[in-house]
């Protein structure tokens, strides 16, 4: 069945922690992605940004998780109003920012 929101959030946090702790060389060869507004529709917005990174084994599981948690189909090159379209950041920074926000949501019990 569908993954409960609290479980989904916890699993995603664990995976992002794993990425940040195991990072040796520049994550995804220093690829840049659009920054996002960490508000409503965050899973889809994060996927829309990270899906434009290809060939990066370190974030494949994160992409899978976000794809499963986002209720609509997302393709590379697709953008929504949830992106801060004038700001690109490294994937490593994107992951750190997302992790901090997700941890905050988890502490506050905001699972959806």
């Amino acid at each position: 069945g569908p993954v409960p929101p609290s479980t989904a959030l916890r699993e995603l946090i664990e995976e992002l922690v794993n990425i940040t702790q195991n990072q040796k060389a520049p994550l995804c060869n220093g690829s840049m992605v659009w920054s996002i507004n960490l508000t409503a529709g965050m899973y889809c917005a994060a996927l829309e940004s990270l899906i434009n990174v290809s060939g990066c084994s370190a974030i494949e599981k994160t992409q899978r998780m976000l794809s499963g948690f986002c209720p609509h189909k997302v393709s590379a090159g697709q953008f929504s109003s949830l992106h801060v379209r004038d700001t690109k950041i490294e994937v490593a920074q994107f992951v750190k920012d997302l992790l901090l926000h997700l941890k905050k949501l988890f502490r506050e019990g905001q699972f959806n």
């Epitope: 993954v3 995804c28 690829s31 899906i51 290809s54 060939g55 990066c56 499963g68 590379a76």
Partner: antibody, heavy 118, light 111 residues
Framework: EVQLKESGPGLVAPGGSLSITCTVS????????INWVRQPPGKGLEWLGM???????DYADALKSRLSISKDSSKSQVFLEMTSLRTDDTATYYC????????????WGQGTSVTVSS | DIVLTQSPASLAVSLGQRATISCRAS??????????MHWYQQKAGQPPKLLIY???NLESGVPARFSGSGSRTDFTLTIDPVQAEDAATYYC?????????FGGGTKLEIK
């Protein structure tokens, strides 16, 4: 335009080694993954292994001990090396690029034919 | 490794009729709500061509007569109506685990 082209020796002796190069254009090997797939004459496709854009390498379990995949991103080349060749390694060898997530193989080379025979 | 078994090994379908090809996986290829199963078409003397990804999504430029369905271990590729240019061998492929695998292929002949 995305293109992949394999180049190999054509004929290899049993017990020998095989080296195939995949030269790509239209995209960068630093942010795309390349798969190696082979097809014996009249038979189906067999996935051999892949090298990710970030350098991770995955191999098919059955061939792991005989295979080596590497790349030179600056030259846009990916290399497949196979040791201890047998006659049943005779096949057309393809390189294929992974697209974006979910990483299906969206562009393929035309393949290079390799015959293992004395 | 996940073993993919395709059936039938070959089939002949009349022009304009429906062709159905099955692919069964030895274990689930589902992960976080998606099925990591893809379908390829290979015509004689050519490399394979991606048709469908994630079980049911049509690759850009592929005609709408091709469709895919299924989840977990059972998947189907449907061509309806079959055209003369669809004569080819069709392969399923999974990438739910690090070691990817292909099915044995199904050869489609048009009557």
């Amino acid at each position: 335009e995305v293109q992949l082209k394999e180049s190999g020796p054509g004929l290899v002796a049993p017990g020998g080694s095989l080296s195939i190069t995949c030269t790509v254009s239209g995209f960068s090997l630093t942010d795309s993954s390349i798969n190696w797939v082979r097809q014996p004459p009249g038979k189906g496709l067999e996935w051999l292994g892949m090298i990710w854009g970030d350098g991770r390498i995955d191999y098919a379990d059955a061939l792991k001990s005989r295979l080596s995949i590497s790349k030179d991103s600056s030259k846009s080349q990916v290399f497949l090396e196979m040791t201890s060749l047998r006659t049943d390694d005779t096949a057309t060898y393809y390189c294929a690029r992974d697209g974006y997530f979910p990483y299906a193989m969206d562009f393929w080379g035309q393949g290079t034919s390799v015959t293992v025979s004395s | 490794d996940i073993v993919l078994t395709q059936s039938p090994a070959s089939l002949a379908v009349s022009l304009g009729q429906r062709a159905t090809i099955s692919c069964r996986a030895s274990e689930s290829v589902d992960s976080y709500g998606n099925s990591y199963m893809h379908w390829y078409q290979q015509k004689a003397g050519q490399p394979p061509k991606l048709l469908i990804y994630l079980a049911s999504n049509l690759e850009s430029g592929v005609p709408a007569r091709f469709s895919g369905s299924g989840s977990r271990t059972d998947f189907t590729l449907t061509i309806d109506p079959v055209q003369a240019e669809d004569a080819a061998t069709y392969y399923c492929q999974q990438n739910n685990e690090d070691s990817r695998t292909f099915g044995g292929g199904t050869k489609l002949e048009i009557k």
